[in-house]
């Protein structure tokens, strides 16, 4: 009876279990009753990082110098190239597809430490009593306005992204 499932590192095709190609190799032809799976190594600038049945290898990532990228780790037949940014610049994401001078802290966050040539901007959430309503690479969280010192009262509470709104006190007539 033909199998319905195969072992690890195998795949089911034409009612039989064939070996997957190892990392760094692509599938040329499926196995038959009489022959093993045929695999071929990936080319110079290609890779496959898993046991697979792919008929094409993936191209290594290109670290585009026009985007400030350079090679951190050269790719192999089993691994992709890892890019990083030129000195003083910072990756926009984990995949490092482009570079920025420094990242900004979003509304609700303030700058804890300004970027240097070595480290990117460090942001911190605005605690209660403080806010930031801008994206910035230098502005800290600002304290809420003190309505009391202006002889006013809080009409709208502040948040981590907005200041309090002050208004006149309701004066009761005698």
């Amino acid at each position: 009876e033909p199998p319905t499932a195969c072992r690890e590192k195998q795949y089911l095709i034409n009612s039989q279990c064939c070996s997957l190609c190892q990392p760094g190799q692509k599938l040329v032809s499926d196995c038959t009753e009489f022959t093993e799976t045929e695999c071929l190594p990936c080319g110079e600038s290609e890779f496959l990082d898993t046991w697979n049945r792919e008929t094409h290898c993936h191209q290594h990532k290109y670290c585009d110098p026009n985007l400030g990228l350079r090679v951190q780790q050269k790719g192999t037949s089993e691994t992709d190239t890892i890019c990083t940014c030129e000195e003083g610049w910072h990756c926009t994401s984990e995949a490092c597809e482009s570079c920025v001078l420094h990242r900004s802290c979003s509304p609700g966050f303030g700058v804890k430490q300004i970027a240097t040539g070595v480290s990117d901007t460090i942001c911190e959430p605005c605690p209660v009593g403080f806010f930031s309503n801008v994206s910035s690479a230098f502005e800290k969280c600002h304290p809420w306005t003190s309505c009391e010192t202006k002889d006013l009262v809080v009409q709208q509470a502040g948040t981590n992204k907005t200041d309090v709104v002050c208004g006149p006190q309701d004066r009761l007539r005698a």
Epitope: G68, C85, C99, H102, S135, S136, A137
Partner: nanobody, 116 residues
Amino acid sequence: EVQLLESGGGLVQPGGSLRLSCAASGFTFRDYEMWWVRQAPGKGLERVSAINPQGTRTYYADSVKGRFTISRDNSKNTLYLQMNSLRAEDTAVYYCAKLPTLFQDWGQGTLVTVSS
């Protein structure tokens, strides 16, 4: 396409002054935080000064505090850096940058040389 064109650099004696300008185009200048960044020969990038979109809040590196003044004219799409009491260690290429600054938006910079 973002374009930032720095100017105003040159050779100046220690204790002298210079005013750098940065003409911006290709984006809505008034909406962006702007920075001056410098690179001394053989050194890394140093963030010198920054200004918020409205021009009401500023940042200065400790090394230039009290000597440099950043300003902007949103009607002229221009950023400025007034540099007084210049020192030999201020010698660098000065770049202006918008936030966020992508590598490909980086200008050519203007060279400031402080020497007697």
